[in-house]
């Protein structure tokens, strides 16, 4: 037997993190996002749940909705109508999938100081929103869309086709919610509130995934979800626009699909209102390398929506799939014709382009061996965007302003030098026309949120600086975090290393690789975090490493598209390469190396453990994908094509975890999955377990009854991290 090794942080009065700290969320941080209601006014929910109004220019602030009113209906969220006469209060939040939930809604009349009675809203509602002007309400109930001209008015039913698990109006089905829209809604008001655009998803022909939900009853319930796996029948999608001024006169009008898209299976990808009578729709072929942006206009004479061919813009990838994770959306300029959009330039880096007439004549606005990530706002004279350009670190995010009024346009980094050590990863929230904006810095130091003048970029005030967290961390021994790059052949891999306190290069430490590695993801980010791996470094003396291998984002298409049609190859190879490089650094105990990951990371960690290299002693896979045939069509096919003989079936079969069952014989493997995982179905782990049993390979496993992909209920999460900690400590011979 090897002697057990106990890591003891030496020398000072500071204490190490404990697992309890992590599970209790003791060191969680706060961010502050203003809820903008005008150019210079915003709302924010205070610590004690009052809804407070702020005016930046007059410096006035007052409670517009008291916590007692919130409490009277157990409200957890709110929404002010644009005419400021009403507030909806949201309660009885009931989570469905990643973004979707149902809730009960109450309308509070701010002028009368009472709840609106009569024609109360049905319950539970799937989605509800105010019009952008006035106080019209659109809501989705039982898969149909309803409209109220005023909160106290009777509702007008816009759609009648809605049917549970069959037809969805104004809300996405499972696959569109998770893999395409990333929202709980599929309806959009025109800027003046005259028109309402919405999507109808017909899931009638989609195969059903069914799983048991055990609950407390004598018999389990069966959850049925129309869920298209790779190669299966997909939702049939249609887009409609209804005139909400006279919804009964005309009825919803269907927006035509571009001919080049409609000729085979296709997806709707997003809708952007350009003006009160102009709308932009984005479509995508099922083989997701061709995207079409279509600009449509309302023709008063026929009361019709027209999408002429000369307003169709095609975006195509010849090396992989269109877009990043999603196809980017356009940011239209004031002329309501030209727009700015992020797509790959000739060198394969995603950059901002200006499109005036055709994509072929697009003017490239940004360029370089880095990527533009998001366009926040386009105003008359400025364009605000984020990128990872600064100092060449792909895992940073800074906010830039391009003065588009100037010729040539001039570029300024708004955030690069504000709090250089503390803040290297920003996002922003702009008032309507960017007169003011908030910056939210996520790290690498303590997160901080600040308010700025949109013209001068001057900081006006600190909104949240996490002082309490700073104080509570004073007596904690936090690990040291390094972000560096390693080279192998012609490839460069960025990695983040979390080193135990009092780290000594002359000593040997166990190594845990944390991996995600999915296409267009990024793990090596300059952000603040105190989580499970922070604890493992701080208390247990484990070195943690995260590596962004091929297929990860924001380093150009050559790196990103390397994994196209062959998932499970280079992601794994690059983790192995990194481990070998870490061993060469001299402070890693080669006998004590582990890998763990969740979801796509569970897939990669499983394949790495089964690589036959002998690099890993043990590893954990939580909710892993085990075959791309088991996962959602939109995701799997984006990166793998179709699982058909004449397309890519061979690699679908070669890239399964089950195909490598024999190779798990010489590693300790812990397989974990929630039984009510709607996303990566329990089927994935069931098949791994079956293959391992058939191969007579010993392994450890844990299931979490009735838990979904996040295994996030308090009790389950505690059990999960405690269980994984025991497994790792045993693997690394660390005593309890």
């Amino acid at each position: 037997l090897r002697p057990s090794r106990v890591y003891k942080p030496e020398g000072n009065t500071k204490r190490a993190l404990t697992l309890k700290d992590i599970l209790n969320g003791t060191f969680s941080y706060k961010t502050y996002f203003p809820n903008w209601i005008s150019e210079q006014e915003y709302l924010h929910q205070s610590e004690d749940d009052n809804i407070v109004f702020y005016n930046i220019e007059t410096r006035e602030s007052y409670i517009i909705l008291s916590n007692s009113t919130m409490k009277s209906v157990n409200a957890t969220d709110y929404g002010l109508s644009p005419d400021r006469q009403f507030v909806y209060l949201e309660s009885d939040y009931s989570k469905l999938w990643r973004y979707s939930y149902t809730a009960t809604y109450y309308i509070y009349d701010l002028q009368n100081g009472e709840f609106v009675r009569g024609y109360e809203l049905p319950r539970p509602i799937q989605y509800l929103c105010w019009s952008p002007v006035g106080s019209k309400l659109a809501y989705v109930y039982q898969n149909n869309i309803y409209l109220k001209q005023r909160p106290g008015d009777p509702p007008f039913q816009i759609t009648y086709t809605g049917r549970e698990n069959r037809i969805f109006n104004g809300i996405p089905d499972w696959v569109y919610e998770e893999e395409m829209l990333a929202t709980k809604y599929a309806l959009w008001w025109s800027p003046d509130g005259k028109f309402l655009a919405y999507v109808e998803f017909n899931d009638s022909d989609i195969p059903i995934i069914a799983y048991s939900y055990y609950g407390d009853g004598q018999y389990p319930r069966t959850i049925n979800i129309p869920y298209p796996k790779a190669g299966a029948k997909n939702p049939v999608v249609r887009v409609f626009i209804v005139d909400t001024t006279y919804p009964h006169h005309v009825g919803p009008m269907e927006v035509p699909v571009p001919e080049m898209i409609a000729s085979s299976d296709y997806y709707f990808s997003w809708l952007t209102w350009v003006s009160s009578e102009r709308v932009c729709l984005q479509w995508l072929k099922r083989v997701q390398n061709v995207s079409v942006l279509s600009i449509c206009d309302f023709r008063e004479d026929w009361h019709a929506w027209e999408c002429p061919k000369n307003q169709e813009h095609v975006e195509e990838s010849r090396t992989g799939w269109a877009g990043g994770f999603f196809v980017s959306t356009p940011a239209f300029s004031q002329d309501a014709t030209s727009y700015y959009k992020i797509f790959s330039d000739k060198d394969g880096y995603k950059h901002i382009h200006y499109i005036k007439d055709t994509v072929e004549n697009a003017i490239q606005i940004t360029s370089g061996k880095w990527e533009a990530i998001y366009i926040f706002r386009v105003t008359q004279d400025s364009l605000f965007y984020s990128s990872n350009e600064f100092e060449g670190y792909p895992g940073r995010r800074n906010i830039y302003r391009i003065s588009i009024g100037n010729s040539p346009p001039s570029k300024k980094c708004v955030t690069c030098h504000l709090r250089k050590e503390r803040c290297q990863y920003y996002t922003a929230s702009f008032s309507y026309k960017a007169k003011y904006y908030a910056l939210v810095c996520y790290g690498p130091g303590l997160p901080i949120s600040t308010l700025h003048d949109g013209r001068t970029d001057q900081e006006i005030q600190v909104l949240e600086e996490n002082k309490e967290l700073e104080n509570s961390l004073r007596n904690i021994q936090l690990p040291k975090v390094e972000i560096k790059k390693l080279k192998d052949g012609g490839l460069t891999f960025w990695y983040k290393m979390i080193l135990p306190p009092q780290f000594d290069r002359s000593k040997k430490y166990p190594l845990l690789i944390q991996v995600y590695g999915g296409p267009c993801s990024q793990s090596v980010k300059s952000v603040f975090a105190v989580n499970w791996i922070t604890y493992l470094a701080s208390k247990e003396g484990i070195v943690i490493a995260l590596v962004d291998g091929r297929g990860t984002a924001f380093q150009g298409d050559k790196f990103l598209h390397a994994v196209y049609r062959k998932l499970g190859v280079y992601e794994v190879e690059d983790q192995l390469t990194a481990v070998r490089k870490f061993i060469e650094m001299g402070f890693i105990d080669e006998e004590r190396i582990a890998i763990w990951g969740w979801s796509y990371g569970g897939y990669v960690s499983s394949l790495a453990l089964a690589s036959g290299t002998g690099l890993f002693k043990c590893g954990i896979a939580v909710a892993p994908v085990s075959s791309w045939e088991y996962y959602a069509s939109i995701y799997s096919e984006r990166f793998m094509g179709l699982p058909t003989k004449d397309d890519n079936l061979e690699h679908y079969k070669n890239s399964t975890v089950m195909a490598r069952a024999e190779y798990f014989r010489n590693v300790d493997y812990l397989l974990i999955h929630g039984t009510a995982d709607d996303n990566v179905h329990f089927q994935n782990s069931a098949q791994i377990a079956k293959a391992l049993v058939n191969a007579q390979v010993d392994f450890q496993a844990m299931w979490y009854s009735d838990q979904n992909h996040g295994i996030s209920s308090g009790r389950s999460q505690n059990h999960l991290y405690t269980h994984m900690t025991h497994f790792l400590k045993q693997c690394f011979s660390l005593s309890d």
Epitope: R238, F240, V250, G251, P252, M253, E254, V255, P256, V257, P258, E259, C296, R299, W302, A304, W305, E306, C307, P308, K309
Partner: nanobody
Framework: EVQLVESGGGLVQPGGSLRLSCAAS??????????IGWVRRAPGKEEELVAR????????RYADSVKGRFTISCDTSKNTAYLQMNSLRAEDTAVYYC????????????WGQGTTVTVSS
């Protein structure tokens, strides 16, 4: 080749009814890019779009002058649109044209040859 052929016109007394048909060939009226309309032209009057339908969505629109009296519909299995005209008045006398509009091209309209409706006692 696209063709629209109207039928059903004729002489009718005030208060009477007629049903006009518009048989389309060369394009699909069920396509989301297609709108079918009935346009009338009468001597000394401005051309008027009396009704239009988008068969894919069932979206209909009527001129105020015919609201509640005329009904536009389509039978996609026959690729045919109809205009049911009730409570006809003398001012409804006109040549009625079936028009097909493509939502993929500005003002690109196919026209039929027209059918005459005369309302007179």
């Amino acid at each position: 080749e696209v063709q629209l052929v109207e039928s059903g016109g004729g002489l009718v007394q005030p208060g009477g009814s007629l049903r006009l048909s518009c048989a389309a060939s060369g394009f699909n009226i069920k396509d989301s890019s297609t709108y079918i309309g009935w346009v009338r032209r009468a001597p000394g009057k401005e051309e008027e779009l009396v009704a239009r339908i988008q068969c894919s969505a069932g979206s209909t629109r009527y001129a105020d002058s015919v609201k509640g009296r005329f009904t536009i519909s389509c039978d996609t299995s026959k690729n045919t649109a109809y205009l049911q005209m009730n409570s006809l008045r003398a001012e409804d006398t006109a040549v009625y044209y079936c028009a097909g509009r493509s939502a993929r091209s500005y003002s690109y309209i196919y026209w039929g040859q027209g059918t005459t409706v005369t309302v007179s006692s």
